[in-house]
Structures are given as C-alpha cells and as structure tokens.
C-alpha cells in the first residue's frame, strides 16, 4: 500500500498530551525507531510519569483514506476479552505548511490526533520544494512552534553590513519566489531556503534538510546545506551553509529581524531574537484572554463580544463580513454554521461561507503583535478551509464606547484579513517570564 | 485539602482475589490521572498500572490480564482489581493523583500479602 502522504514520509512527528504528561511519536509511514514499541510500531507512546512505553499503533495495521490515517493494533484495549483494540487515529485538514500532528484526545481504545498539513490539500498550491518539521518539544514537553514565521511567498531580508551583498531566508521551508517574485529574489534559485543576492546574480547557500532542534530550554536552531555538489567560487572550497539560532527574549518585546552574527567561507550563523521561539503558552490561548503568570501581560478582548444577535460588519468590496468575536453568538446571516467571521456575497445573499468558527479560536500576543484567529471555517477548492486573522491596534480613543471596528484588509488564498483599532487591544505588561 | 485514602488490602492466598480503592478528596477528580504503585519490603516503589484523565489504561507486563484499573468519578474513587495473585505481588500498594496544575499527591499505602 503507498504512503498516503509522502511530504510526512521522511521524519517522526511528535505530539504530546500534556494532561497526562505522555509524548507520542509517529511516523506515518514506517515505523518509529524505539526499541520498547517494537519494530513495526507507527504511534509510540511514551509515558513520562511511569518511564514505559506503548505501541498505540502498528505500522502493518495501518488503513488509510484522503483525510483519515488509522493504525490498529494487536492489544486488547480492555480487560473483558472483547475484539476491541487499541488503536490511533489521524484526521488530516489541508494546512499553509507541513503543520503538526496535535494530539486531541484519547478514550479507553482510540487515541486521537489531528493534523492540518499541505499534505492533505486538494491541490498543490501550498506545498513548498523542501519543507522541514517546523516545531520542537523542550524537555518539559513545552511545545516550541514557529510555523507561523514561515512565510509562504517572499523571504526575510537578514540583518547585515556587508553593503554588496543581502542575505534572504525563509524558515524551514524554501522561498518561493514564484508567488511573489520580487526583484531581487526573482534570480534566487528554486528549493534554496537561504538566497545570497550579489549585484544581479542570486545563489543558493542553504536548503532545509533537517527539522527544528532545541539547544536550550529558550534556543532553537535551524541548520540550511546547500545539497548541490558544485561549490561557490566566492566560498574558498567550502560548502555553503547556513544556521539559524532562534532566541525566546527574557522579557516581552517587539519583534526583531534576523541578525547575521558570524560569517566565514560562506558559514553563514544568524540569530533572531522573537517571541515565536518561546513556548506556545506564553504566546497563545484558546480564550479571548491573556494573563497570568505565565504570559507576562494582561490583554482582555471579551468585552467586544456582541449580545442580542448583532454583529460587526465589514466591507470587503465583494462581500460584507459579519463578525462576532470572543463569544458563541450564532451569526443571523451564518445561521447554524457555529461562525465568528461569516462571508455574504453583495450581489447574492445566499452565497453564505463561515469564514472560521467561534470555537475553533486562537488569541496570539507574539513580538508585540496581537492577533484573534478563527480557523476551520467552510472549505475552498483547494480543501483549506477558510480562516480569518484579525490583527489589533491598541487605540484608546477608538470610537464605538473605545470597541472600535474591525476593517477588512484583503485575502490571501482563503485566508481573510482584518485589522483592529480598540481600546481593549491596549496591553498591560508584568515583569519577568 | 487535598489528600487520597487507599483500602481494600488484606491477606489473601494465592490465586485469589483482591479489589483495591482509592478515594479522593479536594481535586477535580475527573481531571487527574491516576496511577497504582507498590513497594515490596527491601526493593524501589514500581508502577502497577495507569488510568489516564481521558480513560486509556497501561499496565506493567507483570500484571497485565491479572489486574484491572478502573474508576468512578462520582465517587471520586480509583479501583484496583487484583485477580490471580500471586506471592510475588505481596506488597505495600499506593496511588498516585497527578494532573498539570498539581504536584503529584501520594496515599498512604495499603498493604497486601498473598500467601498460603
């Protein structure tokens, strides 16, 4: 039987379900490499607590469909002698990138996973040349995601003084140049992650080959090779290479650009200090709220939920948007879609999409920017389904009782924008982290 | 407070049975993991078996198809029970209550001795 999804062939996936403090592994379509699993096991399971591992699903019990992977076993699940086994399933969403396998729940027999991936789309319009794991679990089984950095069209121009030369990157996954073909990245070669610009020449110094690793608890590293034989006759004979050290600030701050920190026969060492390489839960949280501890600031959106039926309404040119955020008020024009963003066509008020739904909702306060996502809304073509960011601007003159009103901003391959101007967006910073 | 009682031991000959309980009191019961322990006299604590706040179930090789986890979260109760015993489970049997906002909370023990 083929691998039903190649792009995840070539590495072993981790989740991990932090309330029983138990990290899976998973290869999709092998097996992982644990001795105490066995050796065909495709879902190992690795309790912490006890120090003993499970096989939760084997690799030559596996059946597949488009958008569900299961891996069956040969262990009961119970002690009564019935035929049920232990077994793990994975439902697969289309994704913008490779994405994570998420660990979502488990019963006494099935453990469930579920995974937005690129993988999974409909058509190829997301999926890159090279693409790497772009997430890493620290020792406390924290989850470390810089997903959201990777740019899908583009690049990140890095921090340099050589005036004759500039150095893009892109993380994890290459730049694709296609889709955004600027003009100094029109010349970079296809599958580079790292392209070095000189005058009107552009070359490959680094392609993604393995995942995300994790140093120290707040620095993680990304190493680029360029794959090529053929070496730069700027390079002094040495193979070009690039290492990015990603670094979790000490405090809260704004966003930094990456920074060339060393350079030498084309060994090219860059850091970037940003807050996307800090834990998921200092960054996000599934509530319209942000505070404790743990998150080092206070931000609280609920008070611009809606009651009684009414919306906010924003004008896309084509469309009208009805949002409702930080509640579970059905939208009157979405009804019975469970949608915060819902999308009505002018010219035909039945053309009704959910542009992402009110409990599928991530509140994100990274390198000073505050964002609400709502995701999982009706499919497109392409099989990803719609979502909407919304980006705010702490304003506190903001009209509407200080609310403000949300502006739509454009969209980009079902992704719907919005930017915010609200009193509520105004931040308030603790100390230490 | 928070606290967990375990009962249920005794002596009993082998291959007989045994049902363990574990109550507890001050936690979220339905929230936290759950986990048998034991201690036999002049060796380290070993794991027994888990039940997960989800509901799966592990259980050391040793015991596997003899022992039973189960729970009742009405009664804020955790079971263990022990079938086929053998001399080699006699031992001090404890539980463990384990979820991310706590640290692990421990019993006090109970004592179970299989013997002819």
């Known amino acids: 039987q083929a691998a039903p999804f190649p792009e995840l062939c070539s590495y072993t996936w981790e989740a991990v379900d932090t309330k029983n403090n138990v990290l899976y592994k998973i290869n999709i379509c092998g097996s992982v490499d644990i001795v105490q699993c066995g050796p065909s096991s495709a879902v190992c399971m690795h309790d912490l607590d006890t120090r003993t591992y499970h096989s939760v699903g084997d690799s030559v019990l596996r059946s597949a469909t488009r958008s569900l992977l299961e891996f069956n076993t040969t262990v009961s699940c119970d002690q009564q002698g019935t035929n049920h086994r232990v077994q793990s399933s994975i439902a697969f969403l289309c994704g913008k990138t490779l994405g994570t396998p998420e660990f979502v729940t488990a019963t006494e027999c099935v453990h469930y996973f579920e995974w937005r991936t690129t993988a999974a789309c409909k058509k190829d319009i997301f999926k890159a040349n090279k693409e790497v794991p772009c997430y890493v679990f620290d020792e406390e089984l924290r989850k470390h995601d810089l997903n959201p950095l990777i740019k899908l069209s583009g690049a990140y121009l890095v921090d340099d003084s050589d005036p004759d030369t500039s150095l893009f990157i892109n993380v994890c996954r290459d730049i694709d140049t296609l889709r955004d073909p600027g003009s100094q990245l029109r010349a970079c070669p296809p599958g580079t992650a790292a392209c070095l610009v000189r005058g009107h020449q552009a070359f490959d110094v680094g392609q993604p080959r393995d995942g995300l690793k994790v140093v120290r608890k707040d620095r993680l590293v990304l190493s680029y090779v360029r794959e090529e034989a053929g070496k730069l006759d700027f390079c002094d004979g040495h193979s070009p290479a690039v290492t990015i050290t990603f670094v979790c600030p000490s405090e809260r701050r704004e966003g930094t650009i990456p920074k060339l920190t060393a350079k030498s026969n084309c060994r090219y060492e860059i850091e970037w200090i940003t807050e996307y390489a800090c834990h998921r839960d200092y960054l996000e949280s599934k509530t319209c709220s942000l505070s404790g501890e743990q998150q080092d600031v206070s931000i609280d959106l609920t008070p611009l939920a809606q009651s009684g039926g009414s919306s906010y309404i924003s004008d896309g040119k084509e469309y009208l948007f009805y949002l409702n955020v930080c509640g579970e008020t059905e939208i009157q024009f979405c009804n019975k879609k469970q949608a915060a963003v819902c999308q009505v066509k002018k010219s035909d008020t039945s053309q009704v999409k959910a542009a992402g739904r009110y409990h599928n909702q991530t509140l994100r306060y990274s390198d000073g920017d505050l964002t609400l996502i709502y995701f999982g809304g009706d499919e497109c073509s392409s099989g990803f389904q719609r979502m909407s960011v919304i980006n705010f601007e702490c304003n506190k003159t903001a009209g509407n009782d200080g609310k403000g009103t949300p502006v739509f901003t454009g969209e980009v391959d079902c992704t719907y924008f919005f930017t915010w101007d609200t009193e509520y967006a105004c931040v308030h910073h603790h100390h230490h982290h | 407070q928070v606290q967990l009682q375990e009962s249920g031991g005794g002596l009993v000959q082998p291959g007989g049975s045994l049902r363990l309980s574990c109550a507890a009191s001050g936690i979220i019961f339905s929230d936290n993991r759950m986990d048998w322990y034991r201690q036999a006299p002049g060796k380290q604590r070993e794991w027994v078996a888990t039940?997960?706040?989800?509901?799966?179930?592990t259980y050391a090789d040793s015991v596997k198809g003899r022992f039973t986890i189960s729970r009742d979260n009405t009664k804020n109760t955790v079971y263990l029970r022990m079938n086929s015993l053998k001399p080699e489970d006699t031992a001090v049997y404890y539980c463990?209550?384990?979820?991310?906002?706590?640290?692990?909370?421990w019993g006090q023990g109970t004592q179970v001795t299989v013997s002819s």
């Open positions: 463990k209550a384990s979820s991310p906002v706590l640290n692990d909370i």
């Open positions: 039940l997960a706040s989800y509901g799966w179930k």
